[in-house]
């Protein structure tokens, strides 16, 4: 009897949907694997007789409740199927947005870039998929624990009237208010303000 794949799980970030599993111990030789998806009550092959322990399901419709399954195979024998269910639009992890930061005197000017979705023909971002897409920004004075959060209205934000010659750190994440779902924070970007440009009267 061929043992089934172990620890079957979906690793999905920004709709890059990779079904992953581990090869079970099997004394007779090397196992291969077949992974399938369900479409209209018929299972269709996605990865056939692969020696890999993952299969790319990124092309699944983002909106379906999908049933995926994988089994191990050796010669003419095979294991039972291991099934998982997956709804990309609900289950995918929202990766960190990009962020550009520029210092202008005592202000930090930030521009945010929604994470890209891989597609052969178009440049789509997570913002195209989620209507309620917005950003959370948190910033703090470097070396302190107190953090301030803001929710920009647009793809850019300006932090004004900061202390001059002080290093501030900023990070951003995607947020979906209608789902109360937050994405991953970007890596902090730390920049030092310069002087206050206001001219004394």
């Amino acid at each position: 009897m061929v043992p089934p794949p172990e620890n079957v799980r979906m690793n999905s970030v920004n709709f890059k949907n990779i079904l992953q599993w581990e090869s079970p111990a099997f004394a007779k030789g090397n196992l291969t694997f077949t992974a399938q998806y369900l479409s209209y009550r018929i299972f269709q092959d996605k990865c056939m007789n692969t020696t890999l322990t993952e299969c790319d399901f990124s092309s699944l419709s983002k909106y379906g409740d999908h049933t995926l399954r994988v089994r191990a195979e050796f010669a003419d024998e095979h294991s039972d199927w291991v099934n998982i269910t997956f709804c990309p639009v609900d289950d995918t992890i929202i990766g960190p947005p990009g962020m550009q930061v520029e210092v202008l005197a005592d202000s930090l000017h930030m521009r945010f870039l929604a994470p890209k979705i891989e597609n052969e023909y178009e440049t789509w971002t997570m913002k195209n998929v989620y209507n309620s897409w917005t950003y959370n920004v948190q910033y703090w004075k470097n070396g302190t624990d107190e953090k301030f959060q803001i929710t920009p209205q647009y793809d850019f934000e300006v932090l004004r009237n900061l202390e001059p010659w002080t290093t501030y750190c900023v990070q951003v994440r995607g947020f979906l208010p209608d789902r109360n779902k937050a994405g991953e924070w970007s890596e902090p970007v730390c920049e030092q303000t310069t002087h206050d440009e206001t001219v004394p009267s």
Partner: nanobody, 121 residues
């Protein structure tokens, strides 16, 4: 089995245009990728275009820039606008739905009634 109803085929001169339509059930329309594939006599099925529920599209290289796939959400209807038609576009065109949005996945679906497109030079 999913019910899809194609229409809009016909005969045109090279360089002409046609718009194909496909009516689908609401469940199919919202939960699956929709697409078109075609089959010319004696030839393999060829995927043409697909569209996900949010409007993300994919096109076969042979039709890119000439064909446009779109959806009318209110009518649960899929369209294929075909411009600058060529004689090699002559085929039976089929509407399809699949959980997978690739061009290739559409071609694995059962054949419906289809709609004939004939382009003469």
């Amino acid at each position: 089995q999913v019910q899809l109803q194609e229409s809009g085929g016909g005969s045109v001169q090279a360089g002409g245009s046609l718009r194909l339509s496909c009516a689908a059930s609401r469940y199919t329309y919202n939960s699956y990728c929709m697409g078109w594939f075609r089959q010319a006599p004696g030839k393999e099925r060829e995927g043409v275009a697909t569209i996900d529920s949010d409007g993300m599209t994919r096109y076969a290289d042979s039709v890119k820039g000439r064909f446009t796939i779109s959806k009318d959400n209110a009518k649960n209807t899929l369209y294929l606008q075909m411009n600058s038609l060529k004689p090699e576009d002559t085929a039976m065109y089929y509407c399809a739905a699949d959980a997978d949005c690739t061009i290739a996945a559409m071609t694995t679906n059962p054949l419906g009634q289809g709609t004939q497109v004939t382009v003469s030079s």
